[in-house]
Interface confidence: low
Amino acid sequence: CPMSCKCSTTRIWCTEPSPGIVAFPRLEPNSIDPENITEILIANQKRLEIINEDDVEAYVGLKNLTIVDSGLKFVAYKAFLKNGNLRHINFTRNKLTSLSRRHFRHLDLSDLILTGNPFTCSCDIMWLKTLQETKSSPDTQDLYCLNESSKNTPLANLQIPNCGLPSARLAAPNLTVEEGKSVTISCSVGGDPLPTLYWDVGNLVSKHMNETSHTQGSLRITNISSDDSGKQISCVAENLVGEDQDSVNLTVHFAPTITFLESPTSDHHWCIPFTVRGNPKPALQWFYNGAILNESKYICTKIHVTNHTEYHGCLQLDNPTHMNNGDYTLMAKNEYGKDERQISAHFMGRPGVDYETNPNYPEVLYEDWTTPTDIGDTTNKSNEIPSTDVADQTNREHEQKLISEEDLGGEQKLISEEDLHHHHHH
C-alpha cells in the first residue's frame, strides 16, 4: 500500500497530508489485486496534481473515486477509459481550471461532484452547465467559473457565444436492405463549435467503412449479413458542449430457412416443433402427406418465441390419433425465396392392430429431409385424413378434421370422418 495510504482488499484511502502523495496511488505487484478495488478516497493531498492516462486503468472494478481538498489540476483524457464500472466521482475543492466531457462520456455516472474548483469560464466547461440543466435530481451543485475579470460567475448564468450543443441528422428514416447487398447511410451534423461526426455501429457483423466530408458523413456497409437485422446504427455529432445522435435500425431482408424441424412431442398438446429464420416474416404453410393442411382450432401453427427474424413455434395438434400419422412438410416463403422441410410423425397405432406382432408396421417414428422431397400428387387422396369405421359417436366428435380447399384462400371446412367418406366416394 503506498505511503500515506491505507488499503483493504476493496478500498484505498489516502488522507494523511504528511508526507502525502504526489502521484495517484498504485499497488505494488503481488500485493492486493487492483481489480478488486471498488473505492479510492484521496483527501488533503496538496501535491497530487495530475491523473495520468495509465494511473487508474488497473482498477477496473472501481465504482467510487473521491479526490477532495487536494491539488488536482489536470486529468488525462483517457484516464478512465478502462473504468467502465465508475459510478461516483467527487473532485470537490481541487485546482481544476478545466475538465472535458471526453473524460466521462463513456461512463454511466450517477454522481459527478465538482464544487470548489477554480474553473475558467470558457466553452470548454459549457458541457457542465448543460449537464446541470438536464440533470433530473434537484440537488444540483453550485458551480462557478472565473471570468476574464477573475470574478466568480455562477455556471448557471454562463453565456458563451458560438458555444452550443451540436445536432446530428440521418438522411434515411429507416434502412431496409437485401442480404448480400450494400448500402450507404448519410448524415448531416451542425453546430458551433463545429462538431466531429462519428458512427456508432455497435456489434455490426457486416463490413463497413465511413467517410466524412465537412458536415456530411457517410457510412458504407457492404455484403450485408442477415445477422445484422435489427441492429442500430447511430450518427453522433460531438463538440465541447455535448453530443447529439440520430439512429436508424437496420432491417435486412433475406430468404427463409427452416433451421429446425423435429418429431412430435407431447405436452398439454402435441407439438411438431420448428424454427424458421427470414425477413420479412415468412408465411408458413403445412402440408400433410403432400397436400395442403388447412389449419383449425384442432390443428394450428403457434409461434411461441420471436427473436427478431427468428421464429420458434409448433404445429399444435389437439388429441391426434392414428389418423394423423404421416408426413408433415413445413414450407416457409417470403418474397426472397422459400424453404421446405419434412418429418414423418407417428402419434399412435391403428386400433385393433398389435403392431408389436406386426412386422409390417413402420417402426421409424420420423425422418428429416433438409431438401424438398416429392410431396405427392394433390389430385389423389393424399389430402384425405385416413379414416376408420368408428362406431362410437363420442369418439367421432374428437376425430373431426379439416379438408383443404384447392384455393389457399378458400374457406376452411371442418368435417367429420363420415363426411370424408362421402367427399371422396361421391
Partner: antibody, heavy 119, light 112 residues
C-alpha cells in the same frame, strides 16, 4: 397514384390552436419522411419540420419549435401538424410534402391548407 | 443556418426566349464523397402547390420537360429554361438539403 390530401381552410382567433391533417394514399406512409412547409401570402417557402412516421421522431426548424407539433396516425396513414398560440403572423398556406430519397427533396405536395388568424 | 439567395427577384421574357436564374448558397452544398450537390428547384404556378423540377442540382424529375436544365456546383447554381412557354409563368424556388432545409426567396417569371 401518390396523393397527399390536406384538410380544408381554417379561420381561427388569436391565441387559439389548430390541427391540420394530411392523408397519404398511393404509397406506404412509413416509407418516407413527411415534411411541413409554410408560405405566407406573397412570400417564399419556409420549412417547418419533418416527422419519421415509423417512430414519430421529429426535426424542426428552430423558428417553429414550440409553435408546431408534428404527429402521425399510422392506422389512417395521416400526418398532422398542430399550431398553437396563434397570431396574425401564422396566417399562411401550410403544405405537407413527402420527402424522397433520404428526404433530400420533396416529390409530392399536398394542395395546401389556408390558415387565417383573425379576431 | 444556410442562407439561399436567388436573383433576379423577377424577370419578364417573351415566349420562345431563353431564361436563366441564379441561386447562391452561403456554404457549399457539395458532398465531396458522393459528388452530389444537395440542391433542388421547384416551380410554383399561381394558386398551386410547388412542384419538383430538378434535384441533385442537375437531375430532372420524371415528367419535367427537357427545356428545364439545372447546373452549377458548390455554392452557385443556375436554372435555365431554353425556350420559355406561356405555361412556365410561375415562381421558381431553389432549396438546399445539405443541413435541414432552406428555400430561396424565389424568382418570379413573367411572360411578356
Amino acid at each position: 397514384e401518390v396523393q397527399l390530401q390536406q384538410s380544408g381552410p381554417e379561420l381561427v382567433k388569436p391565441g387559439a390552436s389548430v390541427k391540420i391533417s394530411c392523408k397519404a394514399s398511393g404509397y406506404t406512409l412509413t416509407d418516407y419522411y413527411m415534411n411541413w412547409v409554410k408560405q405566407s401570402h406573397g412570400k417564399s417557402l419556409e420549412w417547418i419540420g419533418d416527422i419519421n412516421p415509423n417512430n414519430g421522431g421529429t426535426s424542426y426548424n428552430q423558428k417553429f419549435k414550440g409553435k408546431a407539433t408534428l404527429t402521425v396516425d399510422k392506422s389512417s396513414s395521416t400526418a398532422y401538424m398542430e399550431l398553437r398560440s396563434l397570431t396574425s403572423e401564422d396566417s399562411a398556406v401550410y403544405y405537407c410534402a413527402r420527402g424522397a430519397y433520404y428526404s433530400n427533396y420533396f416529390d409530392y405536395w399536398g394542395q395546401g391548407t389556408t390558415l387565417t388568424v383573425s379576431s | 443556418d444556410i442562407v439561399m439567395s436567388q436573383s433576379p427577384s423577377s424577370l419578364a421574357v417573351s415566349a420562345g426566349e431563353k431564361v436563366t436564374m441564379s441561386c447562391k448558397s452561403s456554404q457549399s452544398l457539395l458532398n465531396s464523397r458522393t459528388r452530389k450537390n444537395y440542391l433542388a428547384w421547384y416551380q410554383q404556378k399561381p394558386g398551386q402547390s410547388p412542384k419538383l423540377l430538378i434535384y441533385w442540382a442537375s437531375t430532372r424529375e420524371s415528367g419535367v420537360p427537357d427545356r428545364f436544365t439545372g447546373s452549377g456546383s458548390g455554392t452557385d447554381f443556375t436554372l435555365t429554361i431554353s425556350s420559355v412557354q406561356a405555361e412556365d409563368l410561375a415562381v421558381y424556388y431553389c432549396k438546399q438539403s445539405y443541413i435541414l432545409f432552406t428555400f430561396g426567396s424565389g424568382t418570379q417569371l413573367e411572360i411578356k
